[in-house]
Interface confidence: low
């Protein structure tokens, strides 16, 4: 979280999140788990119009999708 994050310099990808995005416009979703490089889960969506945006991993429509991706990643390790 933000409090622990201030203690170390981290390498996150997302400067800010887009609050609203239509799920139908998402072409590809990348989920970066929290780890030494960044204290929080980050979600980068490649939209069908070519744009890349960061999404809020707490967004209700994303939560289940993200959990599935993280779970499948854990199984590979």
């Amino acid at each position: 979280g933000p409090v622990s994050a201030v203690l170390t310099e981290l390498r996150c990808t997302c400067l800010r999140v887009t609050l609203r995005v239509n799920p139908k416009t998402i072409g590809k979703l990348q989920v970066f788990p929290a780890g030494p490089q960044c204290s929080k889960v980050e979600v980068v969506a490649s939209l069908k119009n070519g744009k890349q945006v960061c999404l809020d991993p707490e967004a209700p429509f994303l939560k289940k999708v993200i959990q599935k991706i993280l779970d499948s990643g854990n199984k590979k390790n």
Partner: antibody, heavy 119, light 107 residues
Framework: QVQLQQSGAELVRPGTSVTISCKAS????????IVWVKQRPGHGLEWIGD????????FYSENFKGKATLTADTSSSTAYMHLISLTSEDSAVYFC????????????WGQGSLVTVSA | DIKMTQSPSSMSASLGERVTITCQAS??????LSWYQQKPWKSPKTLIY???RLADGVPSRFSGSGSGQDYSLTISSLESDDTATYYC?????????FGAGTKLELK
């Protein structure tokens, strides 16, 4: 402590270009975003774009696409903003700023670089 | 783009007075709001981030509140050093956008 040292004032001719530098110290340059902000008297503060040298990401305001180019030299911990086709509308103070520890706000600011476009 | 409506545009207050500046976003920004203080010919200084959190080294007389679309910055007891222009910034959605500023002067 975190410091952002910007280049000095520039007086340039219309139609020419200018490059402003922002040298960072006191932290790991590639771990944070550098943001650029424009300020004109009576126009407040306006976000130009930002750059994350650690991942090679740049984002631009629609208003500055084709006007500003953001780059960085990680070996010298310096960010640059190149402005082209200058007009009087580009006369302003330009600030660089470093993001907060989780990238969502502007925690530390440079002292500003004044650009004056005049014939 | 999200529009930030800041008010008042200017105000004067007496030493020791409680001062409140407000910012209204054109849509819910979920507390992704920060406040900055700028003195003439100086760079902005971060006061508050995430609507309520005090930045390092900022006196406790400054505080932030709000949620959804409505946010405020309060100075509990005005000091002479607080005369400046104050800006809000929403950074929840790209592009980040600033309020037009509030110029605060001493009476």
């Amino acid at each position: 402590q975190v410091q952002l040292q910007q280049s000095g004032a520039e007086l340039v001719r219309p139609g020419t270009s200018v490059t402003i530098s922002c040298k960072a110290s006191g932290y790991t340059f590639t771990n944070y975003w550098i943001v650029w902000v424009k300020q004109r008297p009576g126009h407040g503060l306006e976000w130009i774009g930002d750059l994350y040298s650690g991942g090679g990401y740049t984002f631009y305001s629609e208003n500055f696409k084709g006007k500003a180019t953001l780059t960085a030299d990680t070996s010298s911990s310096t960010a640059y903003m190149h402005l082209i086709s200058l007009t009087s509308e580009d006369s302003a103070v330009y600030f660089c700023a470093r993001s907060g520890y989780d990238r969502t706000w502007f925690a530390h600011w440079g002292q500003g670089s004044l650009v004056t476009v005049s014939a | 783009d999200i529009k930030m409506t800041q008010s008042p545009s200017s105000m004067s207050a007496s030493l020791g007075e409680r001062v409140t500046i407000t910012c209204q976003a054109s849509q819910d920004i979920e507390s992704y709001l920060s406040w900055y203080q700028q003195k003439p010919w100086k760079s902005p200084k971060t006061l508050i981030y995430y609507a309520t959190r005090l930045a390092d080294g900022v006196p406790s007389r400054f505080s932030g509140s709000g949620s959804g679309q409505d946010y405020s910055l309060t100075i509990s007891s005005l000091e002479s050093d607080d005369t400046a222009t104050y800006y809000c910034l929403q950074h929840g959605e790209s592009p980040p956008t600033f309020g037009a500023g509030t110029k605060l002067e001493l009476k």
